[in-house]
C-alpha cells in the first residue's frame, strides 16, 4: 500500500494570512509538472478563521490552537490525504503583529511560538510562522496580481483571459489596504527611486523589474480610525465627540484605555479628564474628509515628491489593482464599477454618510453593526488616501481597478509569498522543459 510511489500530478500549498483584524487560510493548487510556468497556480479554498487577529491572543495564547482548528481541519478535507505530508504550510503575520512587536518583542515571539507549535501538530509540511515586513507585503501583493493577470508571461496572446488585461506586458501597480497598514507598489516610469528603502529589484521570467514599494504602518483602515479618534478627542470640550465620519444618530461609547492601547495613537496621547467618551455621529462627508487629511503630514518632503509623512512617492504610472479592504469597502458601497468616476464616488459617499443610522441599519439588516457603522469612515478614508495621500486625480482614478479575485484567486500577498517560498517564480524564462533554476525573488 505504498501510495508514496505514485504521487499525484498536482501539488498543494497553504498560506495563512494573519492580519490585524482576522486570519484567513488559503489553499493553492497547481499541476506538478508545470511548476515553473506562469499562471498555473490557483486558489481552491479560502477559510476565514473565526475570531480576531492573532495579536489579540497575547493574554490568552492557550486559545490559539482551538482558534486555528476549524480552518486547518478544512484544509485536511480539501487536500487529498495522500498529499498532506508534502503540502507546505506558511503563516505570515502582517501589521497587527508588527505593532505588537513594537510594543513588546517578547509578547510577539510568544504568540508566534504558540502559533508554530499549533500548526506543527498537523500532518502537513509546516514551514514556519513569521512576521513579514511591510516591504514584503507590498512586493508579494504586486507579484500576486501580476502573476494572475499573466503579466510575467512572455507569450503575447491575441485574446484576453482576465477582464483587466490589456495585451501589453506592462505590469499593474498594487494598492493594498489592511486593518493596520496600507501598501503601494508599482514600477515607476524611467524614474529613479530616490529612497533606497523603497526600491526593489526583481528578475522574473527573464525580465528585470525596478519596483517602488512602501507600507504605511498605522494607516490601515482600523488604525487610521483610532488615530482620527485620538486626534479629535484632544480638542473635544467634554466626553462627547461629535464625529462627521459616523451616520447621524449613531452613538458609541469608547474607552480611553482602548484608544491609547495601540502604538498608532501615541502621538496624540494626552491625559483626559474622563475614562470614556461617546461618539455621536453627524454624518458629514466633507468634514470627515477634512478630519482624515489631518492624519497626513504633507508639509515636509525631503525628496522631489512625497506621498505623506515625508515618504518618497514617484509619479504614478499605469494601471493599479486595489484589493483587500480597498475592494471590500468599495464593493459594499457598490462603487467598484470601472464606469464610476471619482466625482461620482465622492457624490455617493456624501449621500451615504448623510443617511441616518436607523435607516442604514434597516437597509443593511444582515450586516454586523460594528462593520456597518464604519463604512462611512472607511469609504471616506479610501478616497482621502488615494487622492490626497497617493495623488491620484479625477483623471487617473480610471486607472484604479478595485479587484477582489482574479481568475478565482484572491488578490493579496499570500499567493506571491507562496510562489516565492516554493521557488515557483524562476529568474529566467523556463524552456518548454523546466530547467533547474537557482535565482529566485
Amino acid at each position: 500500500t505504498q501510495n508514496k510511489a505514485l504521487p499525484e500530478n498536482v501539488k498543494y500549498g497553504i498560506v495563512l494570512d494573519a492580519g490585524s483584524s482576522h486570519t484567513s487560510l488559503y489553499i493553492y493548487k497547481w499541476p506538478a509538472e508545470k511548476e515553473n510556468d506562469t499562471g498555473v497556480v490557483h486558489q481552491v479554498e479560502e477559510c476565514r478563521v473565526k475570531g480576531p487577529g492573532i495579536s489579540k491572543f497575547v493574554q490568552k495564547v492557550n486559545e490559539i490552537g482551538i482558534y486555528l482548528t476549524d480552518c486547518m481541519e478544512r484544509a485536511r478535507e480539501v487536500i487529498p490525504r495522500s498529499q498532506h505530508q508534502e503540502t507546505p504550510v506558511y503563516l505570515g503575520a502582517t501589521a497587527g503583529m508588527r505593532l505588537l512587536r513594537m510594543e513588546s518583542e517578547e509578547l510577539a515571539d510568544r504568540v508566534l511560538d504558540v502559533v508554530e507549535r499549533s500548526l506543527s501538530n498537523y500532518p502537513f509540511d509546516f514551514q514556519g510562522a513569521r512576521i513579514i515586513t511591510g516591504q514584503e507585503e507590498g512586493a508579494y501583493g504586486w507579484i500576486t496580481i501580476n502573476y494572475l493577470l499573466g503579466k510575467f508571461s512572455q507569450k503575447t496572446r491575441w485574446f484576453s483571459i482576465v477582464p483587466y488585461e490589456t495585451n501589453n506586458q506592462e505590469t499593474f501597480g498594487a494598492l493594498d489596504l489592511g486593518g493596520a497598514s496600507t501598501q503601494v507598489t508599482f514600477v515607476p516610469q524611467n524614474q529613479t527611486i530616490e529612497s533606497p528603502d523603497n526600491a526593489l529589484q526583481f528578475r522574473l521570467y527573464g525580465k528585470d523589474y525596478n519596483v517602488y514599494t512602501h507600507s504605511f504602518l498605522c494607516y490601515g483602515k482600523d488604525q487610521a480610525l483610532w488615530q482620527k479618534l485620538a486626534k479629535d478627542i484632544q480638542v473635544a470640550s467634554n466626553e462627547i465627540l461629535r464625529d462627521p465620519c459616523f451616520h447621524p444618530g449613531y452613538k458609541k461609547v469608547v474607552n480611553v484605555s482602548d484608544l491609547y492601547k495601540t502604538p498608532c495613537t501615541k502621538r496624540f496621547e494626552m491625559t483626559l479628564p474622563f475614562q470614556q467618551f461617546e461618539i455621536q455621529g453627524i454624518g458629514n462627508y466633507q468634514q470627515c474628509h477634512q478630519s482624515i487629511l489631518e492624519l497626513f503630514n504633507t508639509s515636509y518632503c525631503p525628496y522631489s515628491q512625497c506621498a505623506f509623512n515625508g515618504i518618497f512617492l514617484p509619479p504614478l504610472q499605469g494601471d493599479f489593482g486595489a484589493f483587500s479592504a480597498f475592494y471590500f469597502v468599495m464593493k459594499f458601497l457598490n462603487l467598484t464599477s470601472e464606469k464610476v468616476s471619482q466625482e461620482k464616488v465622492t457624490e455617493m459617499m456624501k449621500k451615504f454618510c448623510a443617511q441616518p443610522w436607523e435607516e442604514i441599519k434597516t437597509s443593511y439588516a444582515g450586516v454586523k453593526e460594528k462593520y456597518l457603522s464604519e463604512y462611512c469612515f472607511s469609504g471616506t478614508y479610501i478616497l482621502s488616501l488615494l487622492l490626497q495621500g497617493y495623488h491620484f486625480t479625477a483623471d487617473s482614478w480610471e486607472h484604479i481597478h478595485f479587484i477582489g479575485k482574479i481568475q478565482g484567486s484572491d488578490a493579496g500577498w499570500t499567493l506571491g509569498y507562496m510562489l516565492n517560498l516554493t521557488n515557483m517564480i524562476p529568474a529566467e524564462q523556463p524552456l518548454s522543459t523546466p530547467l533547474s533554476h537557482s535565482t529566485y525573488v
Epitope: Q2, S82, S120, P123, F126
Partner: antibody, heavy 121, light 107 residues
Amino acid sequence: EVQLVESGGGLVKPGGSLRLSCAASGFTFSKYWMNWVRQSPGKGLEWVAEIRLKSNKYGTHYAESVKGRFTISRDDSKNTVYLQMNSLKTEDTAVYYCTTQLDLYWFFDVWGQGTTVTVSS
Amino acid sequence: EIVLTQSPATLSLSPGERATLSCRASQSISDYLHWYQQKPGQAPRLLIYYASQSISGIPARFSGSGSGTDFTLTISSLEPEDFAVYYCQNGHSLPLTFGGGTKLEIK
C-alpha cells in the same frame, strides 16, 4: 524486506538514563516519519514520540507523560532513529517499539520486534 | 486529547462465529481510526486503516466501518488464529492515542 530492529533496552534505576536505537532497512528511511510506541507489562499501547523529516526541520512531538524527559532524534545517513530517555521512572517500564507508516500517516504498518526497558531500584 | 473507549473488554466466541468489536471516540475524528491485532509476545499488526481501508495480506474476513465517533471492526467468521487482543487507534490528531483493547478469547 522492510525491517526495523530496536536495541539498547535493559535494566536501569529510577532517575537513570537509557538510549534506544532503531535501525531501519528495506525502505528510503529519510522519507518517512518515525515513531516510538510502548507497551507496559500486561497493559495497552501508548504512543511515545514522533520525528518528522529534514524538510520539516526534524520536527518532534511527544506524549505528555514523557515530555521534557525523552528526546527522539534521527540520523538519516545511518538509517537510524533514537530515543534518549532521561529521568526514568518506574512507570516507564515497557516494551518499546519503533514504528513507521509507509503509506500516508499516523498509523503504523511497520513495527520492530521491540526492546524491553525495566526501571527498577 | 482524544480518548478511545473499546467494548467489550473481553469477547468470548467460538470459531466460525461473527465477532463485532466497538471503538468510541471522545470527539469526532472523521475516518481517522485504525485497527491492530496483537498476539502474545508479538508486535501489533495493522489490520484496517482509515476506518474501512483493508490492507493487502490481511484476510477478507476482517472489515471496518464507522465515521465520526463510532467505529466497528467485524470478523465475519472467526478462525482459530484470530483469537488475540485488538486495539483501535486515533490517527486524527496528536497525541496519537490507542483504545484499551478488546481481548477476543475462545469460548
